[in-house]
């Protein structure tokens, strides 16, 4: 090995990487919220929808004191790819009716894609525990039905929106622990 | 510019300990992973250990769980690499590397012979 | 042997491009982990070239670019120069292990 000598900075540090993941999450928290409007205008919900096949809300308000960066990111990861999985599955799935917001489906994929390597990054960069927490992934099959995907539609943009609306919370508050 | 600098390295006898230590600088140490990674004489990369930014997850490859220990004091910018009961087949060059790994010192040869 | 697997060695000439693959399995690559990719020049300590499968660190030429679909990625430097001559070590998280993962290596040789 040679003498020492300087590595010049990479792009992005840590901080930096969750303020890009912050930024990411709000852009995505708003196309979410725009693309449920555009559902709720073509397809009126007839009340809440669920998916039993969706992850359970993370973060409740009361709990975002007690919050610790690898938890929040681990969990983050993990209902992201959850969504990320039902958004591919709506797209491949979805049937007539929902071929009118493809466009919009298909870019929330992409920016979900690039949340989730944002994130990634940040925990390689921490060096914080990757793997996933074991959970049964449960099988997506065809919706039973014409008005199946649209209330499947409605469910996953319903719990993305929330998981979204806390993960910015959560990485906020983060922040000042980093 | 950011600097890694190992240190501790030398010639120890099969069985024996040593102690490498990584001096870092030009850059939040304490918001960075860091990692020792060795390469054998004209050998590849091998990854050895991680720790969190805070200290709290460590990790180990399997040809080295039990034997090294690895440790960070984020008030002096310091990476520790506590290696016991060495074997010839622990002869390398040791680098200390930072984040993704972003950046690598130049590393510290350590030869373990009789 | 290694986890990720790498051609040992590739070769091409000046202006040449050249790609080298690197290939994992379900627990690295495949569950979606980054793929980075460095050089290490000779005698010199590795060098991050490319991270997040194919962003590259300021400072590195617009030549190098990687890659990544499905359990395998691959490395691209276009217009060969006689100073890429190095090693080439592709990395991923790999779940198996809790750690990252390096390939085996391949050493390209700029000919002529």
């Known amino acids: 090995p040679g003498p020492p000598a300087g590595s010049p900075r990479v792009s992005s540090d840590p901080r930096a990487d969750l303020d890009s993941a912050v930024l990411l999450t709000r852009s995505l928290l708003a196309d979410t919220r725009q693309l449920a409007a555009q559902m709720r205008d073509k397809f009126p919900a007839d009340g809440d929808h669920s998916l039993d096949s969706l992850p359970t809300l993370a973060m409740s308000a009361g709990t975002l004191g007690s919050l610790q960066l690898p938890g929040v990111l681990t969990r983050l990861r993990v209902d992201l790819m959850s969504y990320l999985r039902h958004v591919q599955w709506l797209r491949r799935a979805g049937g007539p009716s929902l071929k009118t917001l493809e466009p919009e489906l298909g870019a929330l994929q992409a920016r979900l894609e690039r949340l989730l390597r944002r994130l990634q990054l940040l925990m390689s960069r921490l060096a914080l525990p990757q793997a996933a927490p074991d959970q049964p992934v449960i099988p997506l099959g065809p919706p039973a039905s014409a008005w199946g995907s649209i209330r499947a539609a409605h469910a996953i943009l319903g719990g993305l929106h929330l998981t979204l609306d806390w993960a910015v919370r959560g990485l906020l508050l983060l922040k000042t622990r980093l | 510019e950011v600097q890694l600098l190992e240190s501790g390295g030398g010639l120890v006898q099969p069985g024996g300990s040593l102690r490498l230590s990584c001096a870092a600088s030009g850059f939040t140490f304490s918001s960075y992973g860091m990692h020792w990674v060795r390469q054998a004489p004209g050998k590849g990369l091998e990854w050895v250990a991680v720790?969190?930014?805070?200290?709290?997850?460590?990790y180990y490859a399997d040809s080295v769980k039990g034997r090294f220990t690895i440790s960070r004091d984020n008030s002096k910018n310091t990476l520790y690499l506590q290696m016991n009961s060495l074997r010839a087949e622990d002869t390398a060059v040791y680098y200390c590397a930072a984040g993704v790994p972003d950046y690598w010192g130049q590393g510290t040869l350590v030869t373990v012979s009789s | 042997q290694s986890v990720l697997t790498q051609p040992p060695s590739a070769s091409g000439t000046p202006g040449q491009r050249v790609t080298i693959s690197c290939s994992g399995s379900s627990s690295n690559i495949g569950s979606g982990y980054d793929v980075h990719w460095y050089q290490q020049l000779p005698g010199t300590a590795p060098k991050l070239l490319i991270y997040?499968?194919?962003e590259r660190p300021s400072g590195v030429p617009d030549r190098f670019s990687g890659s990544k679909s499905g359990t395998s990625a691959s490395l691209a430097i276009s217009g060969l120069r006689s100073e890429d001559e190095a090693d080439y070590y592709c990395?991923?998280?790999?779940?198996?292990?809790?750690?990252?993962?390096f390939g085996g290596g391949t050493k390209l040789t700029v000919l002529g």
């Open positions: 997040s499968n194919n």
């Open positions: 990395a991923a998280w790999d779940d198996s292990l809790s750690g990252p993962v």
């Open positions: 720790i969190s930014y805070d200290g709290s997850y460590k």
